[in-house]
Amino acid sequence: LEETLLNTKLETADLKWVTFPQVDGQWEELSGLDEEQHSVRTYEVCDVQRAPGQAHWLRTGWVPRRGAVHVYATLRFTMLECLSLPRAGRSCKETFTVFYYESDADTATALTPAWMENPYIKVDTVAAEHLTRKRPGAEATGKVNVKTLRLGPLSKAGFYLAFQDQGACMALLSLHLFYKKCAQLTVNLTRFPETVPRELVVPVAGSCVVDAVPAPGPSPSLYCREDGQWAEQPVTGCSCAPGFEAAEGNTKCRACAQGTFKPLSGEGSCQPCPANSHSNTIGSAVCQCRVGYFRARTDPRGAPCTTPPSAPRSVVSRLNGSSLHLEWSAPLESGGREDLTYALRCRECRPGGSCAPCGGDLTFDPGPRDLVEPWVVVRGLRPDFTYTFEVTALNGVSSLATGPVPFEPVNVTTDREVPPAVSDIRVTRSSPSSLSLAWAVPRAPSGAVLDYEVKYHEKGAEGPSSVRFLKTSENRAELRGLKRGASYLVQVRARSEAGYGPFGQEHHSQTQLDESEGWREQLA
């Protein structure tokens, strides 16, 4: 980028530059029209018969340097060929010299600084590449010369440019003084300010554009070269903040539109809101969950919103004494999550009707909560109790929901308790054909023993037809019609109002071989 300090083509008034010395044959200002019919100013000099050592100086007005360290001067000029000048002597030249003088203010006068090299600093002696030929009575023909010179390094507030003619016939058509600067640049969402290079290369710190944040790593910088170009090099730049995406060729961050979001800073574009969420404003980093939908704390910000599951379905119970096996089907609605678990709540009601949460004597296998499979075994049920189990399905957002948790209930009533097994049978008397048995009255928890059932069969005769039964209301019995000297296996069970208890252990008894032995009391 070039910043103009002076362009004579754009000056609308007389330039009125200073000349020295005040003699004939000096530089003079002329005017004309350019291609756009704008008036332009030029300077001419043509003292080809000058006295030896006589120089004609032309000095511009004071030019503030505006922070430039190096300034470029583009001269457009024409130079008359000495050979085409009939009056030209040996002092005719086809070159001129350019100088500059620095000062902190417009302090130069018609006589100061002294018109010579030092204090003036020589830039270059300029030779014409193209010479203009002039034939008597004909128009001069020749190309315009264009020469760009470099001034500096400059350090004071401004400077003057000066031209020294020592016998040329020439026209200075235009002068363009400019400096080069690196234009403001936005790359990778990083803005680098307009920079005037003060050295060969100057590091320039960048800043993130609006709604961008620095990327990890070193702060972004670019190098501004002396020629006004940014040095090509990768930029660790910035990235758009959450809720914003890169736009316009990575030069700005644009807010995510309604209905879209961007959860993290960095590359990537705004995405539509995930299921069951919405964003009503622009620039959303996260989409809000619809009513009744939630994100668990561990869910990513871009995850869909989910809801607690519905209740489990079809709970089936299988009661086996004091054990209960429950199983159920998964809920119809999982809530959109994979982390489904089940939990049970339990209430028990005594036969009298008073109810309370289940006591600690119940055990659940694998447990009462955090069940991942749809079943549980409950042990330690008490007889003649009614149990209500509420099976609930839970997921990662159940704890965030308000309101009742849906459940599927199941009621189970255990049987009343039957008498315990009768196990301490003893033979009180035996004969070759009979056995007299007695046993202790079992402690029946649910009322008195109403009667007993004795089950017996000859040892070795295992078939169902060989088994015989005898009922007795007392805690004794006499088995008749037995074989002589035979072994019998006997079992007894008690009956209460709750029903028969289990048969006790088999008792081994033997009839007498001989009648003469008589009845013999056998104590167990």
Epitope: T12, A13, D14, K16, Q22, E28, E29, L30, S31, G32, L33, Q37, S39, T42, E44, C46, T78, L80, T132, K134, G137, E139, A140, C169, A171
Partner: antibody, heavy 126, light 108 residues
Framework: QVQLVESGGGLVQPGGSLRLSCAAS????????MSWVRQAPGKGLEWVSG????????FYADSVKGRFTISRDNSKNTLYLQMNSLRAEDTAVYYC???????????????????WGQGTLVTVSS | DIELTQPPSVSVAPGQTARISCSGD??????VHWYQQKPGQAPVLVIY???KRPSGIPERFSGSNSGNTATLTISGTQAEDEADYYC???????????FGGGTKLTVL
């Protein structure tokens, strides 16, 4: 010798037309930017019109724009001023004047008039 | 456009210095030229580019220009210098020339 000689003045009625000529000699006419300057009786100088050396660019004072036309014939070393729709206030001595010339580039000129003709009187009256 | 203002008349004794002013807005930023016109004659350029003297013009004629005023100075005025003097400059539109109203110099 270097000189400019005007001709074509005279008495003309309001609304009438007149054509002034200026014959140049002693210098390279086709390198010179030329102008017409007038002076009403007892008044000051007033620039009227100007023309570039090649005749391409023409300039007029607001007071004559649309009525006067400047032209030149470089082959005849002559400058012209065609005056139409003349008014009484156009009565004046009309001078032909040369601008300071470039050494060799007729696209440019100095801003002063360094050579004047003797003038020709134009009287507009009924 | 610029307007140039001159005093209608200036009187000077022979041998004295005559100063004729020409004023206009920011005139010092423009080049001013001076013309001498004697009765019945065409104007003659006496000073150009503020202070330059054409060949053939006596050294007693000089000019300056700064601020809003340009001045034509005639040192050691002579009777033959009695004439009307006009300043001129061009307007913002480059090719349009404007003249001052003229100053009649009387040599007493």
């Amino acid at each position: 010798q270097v000189q400019l000689v005007e001709s074509g003045g005279g008495l003309v009625q309001p609304g009438g037309s007149l054509r002034l000529s200026c014959a140049a000699s002693g210098f390279t006419f086709n390198n010179a930017w030329m102008s017409w300057v007038r002076q009403a009786p007892g008044k000051g100088l007033e620039w009227v019109s100007g023309i570039s050396a090649d005749g391409v660019h023409k300039f007029y004072a607001d007071s004559v724009k649309g009525r006067f036309t400047i032209s030149r014939d470089n082959s005849k070393n002559t400058l012209y001023l065609q005056m139409n729709s003349l008014r009484a206030e156009d009565t004046a001595v009309y001078y032909c004047a040369r601008k300071g010339m470039s050494f060799y580039n007729n696209k440019y000129a100095k801003s002063m008039f360094d050579l004047w003709g003797q003038g020709t009187l134009v009287t507009v009256s009924s | 456009d610029i307007e140039l203002t001159q005093p209608p008349s200036v009187s000077v004794a022979p041998g004295q210095t005559a100063r004729i002013s020409c004023s206009g807005d920011n005139l010092g930023k423009k080049y001013v030229h001076w013309y001498q016109q004697k009765p019945g004659q065409a104007p003659v350029l006496v000073i150009y580019y503020d202070s330059k003297r054409p060949s053939g013009i006596p050294e007693r004629f000089s000019g300056s220009n700064s601020g809003n005023t340009a001045t034509l100075t005639i040192s050691g005025t002579q009777a033959e210098d009695e004439a009307d003097y006009y300043c001129s400059a061009w307007t913002t539109t480059m090719m349009h020339i404007v003249f001052g109203g003229g100053t009649k110099l009387t040599v007493l």
